[in-house]
């Protein structure tokens, strides 16, 4: 219907605008008029899809009128000025504000020109990750927990680990209406090898510039795993002192080391020094099985080592340490 040459007047606006719950947001909307075109704007109108009436109107002589005057404001439209900018500010965003809005210009001689804008109401979630301290169970159990609280829409949680494991993710309504709290558990069969290793919780959300990465240091409580080192099956009479070490991995840390032999207490040539056992030089061959017993809060475990001190001069390359 408009006269020839008037088809180029268009309304410019983004198709989608994000805004944060409780904050204010501007819905941008402009009338784009090419240089050679003539247009006169008398009214700016905002309406929400599915609702009766308009929520905001800027009239050439009456100025602005709003359905909710405390929550809406024309950003740039002024009485006596050209009405080319219909941008509307919304204050105190609520979940129910999410939806489709129409921005409309009443123009002459082109007629009405409008565009639709989708307002997306977001809530930025708070993210935490924590270890779930476990004992050896033989069954898969949650070993780490990642929580994204109060997001809109719900955050996406994924786990990254070289250890395998399975996620178990659930959602519940957040404290604020329309928000969601997402909880993800990382599940694995606990083992001592996993203790102290890291897994990463990755949280993705529309409101983040980039994903948030939260690292969890795993904790597995287990009794001591014990071995004895320092013996190379190549000890001879007349050699200098040697040292055996009781190597224990445990969580929590060992609380005590106890050295003994299968025959009972340590012989005189063996002196216990905590996790180490000092072997003094001997003048006759021996064949003794030594025991290291390590205790932590979860129990005690032991390791045995049979030590032989043989006759004959030590070779240049005997494998024992000399002091």
């Amino acid at each position: 219907w408009p006269p020839p040459g008037t088809g180029d007047v268009v309304v410019q606006a983004p198709t989608q605008v994000p805004g944060f719950l409780g904050d204010s947001v501007t819905l941008p909307c402009y009338l784009q008029v090419p240089n050679m075109e003539v247009t006169h704007v008398s009214q700016l109108t905002w309406a929400r899809h599915g609702e009766s009436g308009s929520m905001a109107v800027f009239h050439q002589t009456q100025g602005p009128s709003y359905s909710e005057s405390k929550r809406l404001e024309f950003v740039a439209a002024r009485l006596g000025a050209e009405l080319r900018n219909a941008s509307l500010r919304m204050f105190g965003l609520r979940v129910e504000d999410e939806g489709n809005y129409t921005c409309l210009f009443v123009t002459f001689p082109q007629g009405s020109r409008s565009v639709d804008i989708w307002l997306r109401v977001l809530a930025k979630p708070q993210n935490t990750a924590e270890v779930q301290k476990v004992q050896l169970t033989g069954e898969p159990v949650p070993m780490a927990r990642c929580v994204s609280t109060g997001g809109r829409p719900p955050a996406q949680i994924t786990w990254h680990s070289d250890l395998g494991g399975m996620p178990n993710t659930s959602q519940v309504p957040g404290f604020l209406s329309g928000t969601v709290t997402v909880t993800s558990l990382w599940i694995l069969v606990p083992s001592s090898q996993v203790d102290g290793k890291n897994v990463t919780c990755k949280v993705e959300h529309e409101s983040f510039e980039k994903p948030q990465l939260l690292t969890v240091n795993l904790t597995v409580y287990y009794p001591p795993e014990v071995s004895i080192s320092g013996y190379d099956n190549n000890w001879y009479l007349g050699q200098n002192e040697a040292t055996l070490t009781c190597d224990a991995r445990s969580n929590p840390e060992p609380t005590g080391y106890n050295w003994s032999t299968t025959m009972g207490p340590l012989p005189p040539f063996a002196v216990a020094q905590g996790a180490q056992l000092l072997i003094r030089p001997v003048d006759k061959p021996i064949n003794t099985t030594l025991i290291c017993n390590v205790t932590n809060a979860l129990g005690a475990r032991q390791a045995e080592l049979t030590v032989q001190v043989k006759e004959g001069p030590p070779s240049e390359h005997s494998g024992i340490s000399r002091n």
Epitope: W1, P2, P3, V38, H40, S42, Q43, T45, A47, G53, S54, V57, H59, Q60, T61, Q62, S65, T102, L104, V106, F108, P109, G111, S112, S114
Partner: antibody, heavy 116, light 107 residues
């Protein structure tokens, strides 16, 4: 105070033309589009067309098939409507009206009677 | 052209009555609807713009509502000076069109 004052009544013969004036005051003439609406006696309102005084841009109701011409004189803040090839069914009160999307101010009306 | 169908075409009511006039558009006009009051021998006077917003100086007993295709003008408590004809108008697209009018008489 915004005022739109129209010229007086006209009696015309079929086939003739009529030109009605609408002198404005109380506002900046070039900031508002001027439209014309007619109303046959005891009947409804019919939009004829509009003109933007600044650039002379016009829009017409196709029903008038090129019989109507809208013009302005910016120096006197006056709008004009000329209707040609008059017929008896053009007998009506013709109004000028200031456009604000709707029409917020109207002239007092000019009665045009077409009769042989 | 968009056809605006107004009803009733005429009605009478008593002072203090609540009066409702409706206007139906033949296609979606959003909220681009105005209402006018025309007293005998006078030009129309603008009451409502954008379907629901009152012009300054218009008594608040006049209320407009609606969007899309269905619109209503309500006079909450009729006064003697409201004796007039009422018209709706769409300004969504050219050619602008009016309802045929509702003549309101006072009983």
């Amino acid at each position: 105070e915004v005022q739109l004052v129209q010229s007086g009544s006209e009696l015309k013969k079929p086939g003739a033309s009529v030109k009605i004036s609408c002198k404005t005051s109380g506002y900046t003439f070039t900031e508002y589009t001027m439209h014309w609406v007619r109303q046959p006696h005891g009947k409804g309102l019919e939009w004829i067309g509009g003109i933007h005084p600044n650039q002379g841009e016009t829009s017409y109701n196709q029903r008038f098939k090129g019989r109507v011409t809208l013009t302005v004189d910016k120096s006197t803040s006056t709008a004009y409507m000329e209707l040609s090839s008059l017929r008896s069914e053009d007998t009506a009160v013709y109004y000028c009206a200031r456009w604000t999307g709707d029409f917020d101010y109207w002239g007092q009306g000019t009665l045009v009677t077409v009769s042989s | 052209d968009i056809v605006m169908t107004q009803s009733p075409s005429a009605m009478s009511a008593s002072v203090g009555d609540r009066v409702t006039i409706t206007c139906k558009a033949s296609q979606n006009v959003g909220t681009n609807v105005a209402w006018y009051q025309q007293k005998p021998g006078q030009p129309p006077k603008a009451l409502i713009y954008s379907a629901s917003y009152r012009y300054s100086g218009v008594p608040d007993r006049f209320t407009g509502s609606g969007s899309g295709t269905d619109f209503t003008l309500t006079i909450s408590s009729l006064q003697a000076e409201d004796l007039a004809e009422y018209f709706c108008q769409q300004y969504e697209s050219y050619p602008y069109t009016f309802g045929q009018g509702t003549k309101l008489e006072i009983k």
